[in-house]
Interface confidence: low
């Protein structure tokens, strides 16, 4: 009779993470008598996966009933595969011995490769807001994928970016891999509604890439422009001065009116108008009783936007041009001075 051979017909098996791997093994003879064991790896450090004779292997089931006396199919199934299960599995026949069984013959081995999907890309931006024309960095991370081959692209509002650097770790063999990419984006005033997208393509995704996004509204600060103007008011001896605060983002804004350097009123912008580009406009007004002032009045609109140093714009009101018996305000002039 021909000597027993251990046949592992599959050189390699590819399984998706979470699925069940079937590792096939058959023997060509019932002799010699003795159990089968499965190992991952070879040599003295090999890991026991299944022992027909004894032990508890909760993730492993046999394909056929090994208690049948004439059974020669020693295939196993390993459930809930993870990338950590990757490796070469050997089906080994032992010969019954005393006191210990003796290894008789090994199969050629089956390489189990695990395909694991990358995690959803997480895009993070800078910790602090930046103003238009500044370059900011965004990072994108995705983990746990296998095999190592992966493609990452960056987009801003659908336009592909080219200024980025990507690393896949580790460099050598591993059960799973991570990707880390940093992209540089130049902010513009129109970026409040913009999105930065990191797109990851991998064999496990079957052509449907994963995307992570960051909204530039979380990153950008558009500082306001100020304009102080004087409006005619019908009421006698009163002048209405408005401060137009335009094109700012985010909404967090506090405005203070100063009369000759003294605080007159403080307001917080809330009911603002929104521009198409996502920035805001706001208007505050101050009603000045000219008759209460003997001398010219310097009115200052001071704006603190998003915790930044205040910017201001002033307007000189010529009291001499406002005789108490007239409501005229024609001589008031706007100096347009810009103070920081």
């Amino acid at each position: 009779e021909e000597e027993l051979q251990v046949i592992q017909p599959d050189k390699s098996v590819l399984v998706a993470a979470g699925e069940t791997a079937t590792l096939r093994c058959t023997a060509t003879s019932l002799i010699p008598v003795g159990p089968i064991q499965w190992f991952r790896g070879a040599g003295p450090g090999r890991e026991l996966i299944y022992n027909q004779k004894e032990g508890h292997f909760p993730r492993v089931t046999t394909v056929s009933d090994l208690t049948k006396r004439n059974n020669m199919d020693f295939s196993i199934r390993i459930g809930n595969i993870t990338p950590a299960d990757a490796g070469t599995y050997y089906c080994v026949k032992f010969r019954k011995g005393s006191p210990d069984d003796v290894e008789f013959k090994s199969g050629a081995g089956t390489e189990l490769s695990v395909r694991a999907k990358p995690s959803a890309p997480v895009v993070s931006g800078p910790a602090a807001r930046a103003t238009p024309q500044h370059t900011v960095s965004f990072t994108c991370e995705s983990h746990g994928f296998s095999p190592r081959d992966i493609t990452l692209k960056w987009f801003k509002n659908g336009n592909e970016l080219s200024d980025f650097q990507t690393n896949v770790d580790p460099v050598g063999e591993s059960v799973s891999y991570s990707i880390h990419s940093t992209a540089k984006v130049v902010l513009t005033r129109e970026d409040v509604h913009s999105q930065v997208i990191c797109e990851v393509a991998h064999v496990t995704l079957q052509g449907d890439p994963l995307r992570g996004t960051a909204n530039l509204s979380e990153t950008i600060r558009v500082p306001p422009t100020l304009e102080v103007t004087q409006q005619p008011v019908r009421a006698e001896n009163q002048v209405n001065v408005t401060c137009q605060v335009r094109k700012f983002y985010p909404q967090r804004l506090q405005l203070t009116w100063l009369e000759n350097g003294n605080v007159s009123r403080t307001e917080t912008a809330s009911t603002v108008t929104e521009n198409k580009d996502g920035t805001y406009n706001w208007m505050s007004w101050l009603l000045v009783n000219v008759s209460a002032h003997r001398d010219d009045v310097k009115l200052t609109c001071q704006v603190e936007h998003d915790g930044q140093p205040a910017v201001s714009k002033s307007h000189d009101l010529k009291v001499s041009a406002h005789p108490k018996e007239q409501g005229s305000n024609t001589a008031a002039e706007n100096t347009g001075s810009n103070e920081r």
Epitope: N215, S217, E218, P250, Q251, R252, D306
Partner: antibody, heavy 123, light 107 residues
Framework: QIQLVQSGSELKKPGASVKVSCKAS????????MNWVRQAPGQGLEWMGF????????TYAQGFKGRFVFSLDTSVSTAYLQISSLKAEDTAVYYC????????????????WGQGTLVTVSS | DIQMTQSPSSLSASVGDRVTITCRAS??????LAWYQQKPGKSPKALIF???YRYIGVPSRFSGSGSGTDFTLTISNLQPEDFATYYC?????????FGQGTKLEIK
């Protein structure tokens, strides 16, 4: 001026359905998320969730998944709350309230509220 | 979920008084906190956002302070129209959550 105007009070029997409307005016409804807040008689305020008025995507708080549906008709600037299989414990005033969105520092503060719709469920 | 605890649950005060309502979050919410006023049979009215900023039209006698987990709403020089129920609300984390309310009554 900005207003959120809700539909009138409803008296319903257990098991029935109700649809509450919230019409936005004075601003573009698609610029602000629309939230729904419940206030049971004599109780405090409870956030039910919101609908992204730009994408139409709803987000429901944990206790409001299943029988509660948020929807939107941008052509008439109106958000809707539908409750099915009504129970006595659904008796409450339901408010719509707008928020700026969820990326800004004041993102989840409700700056404007509807007047509320009382839904009474009784057999 | 983040629990918001207001204290006291109710308080009595007189016109002209200064009152303080506190709100404690079960975890850090930064400055993502708002305050609302509600009168019987009416919808809530927004008073304060981002812990300290008054909405336009809210009288300056209302002021907010705090960050992290501890916040206060202070009403100085109480007016007759200020007697109402006040709620705090965090918007740092979903789900958005409110305090149980503080009822301010006339003494």
């Amino acid at each position: 001026q900005i207003q959120l105007v809700q539909s009138g009070s409803e008296l319903k029997k257990p098991g029935a359905s109700v649809k509450v409307s919230c019409k936005a005016s004075g601003y573009s409804i698609t610029d602000y998320a629309m939230n729904w807040v419940r206030q049971a008689p004599g109780q405090g305020l409870e956030w039910m969730g919101f609908i992204n008025t730009y994408t139409g995507e709803p987000t429901y708080a944990q206790g409001f998944k299943g029988r509660f549906v948020f929807s939107l008709d941008t052509s008439v600037s109106t958000a809707y709350l539908q409750i099915s299989s009504l129970k006595a414990e659904d008796t409450a005033v339901y408010y719509c309230a707008r928020t700026r969105g969820y990326y800004d520092f004041d993102g989840g503060a409700f700056d404007y509220w509807g007047q509320g719709t009382l839904v009474t469920v009784s057999s | 979920d983040i629990q918001m605890t207001q204290s006291p649950s109710s308080l009595s005060a007189s016109v002209g008084d200064r009152v303080t309502i506190t709100c404690r979050a079960s975890q850090n919410v930064g400055t993502h906190l708002a305050w609302y006023q509600q009168k019987p049979g009416k919808s809530p009215k927004a008073l304060i956002f981002s812990a300290i900023y008054r909405y336009i039209g809210v009288p300056s006698r209302f002021s907010g302070s705090g960050s992290g987990t501890d916040f206060t709403l202070t009403i100085s020089n109480l007016q007759p129209e200020d007697f109402a129920t006040y709620y705090c609300q965090q918007y740092n984390t979903y789900p958005l959550t409110f305090g149980q309310g503080t009822k301010l009554e006339i003494k």
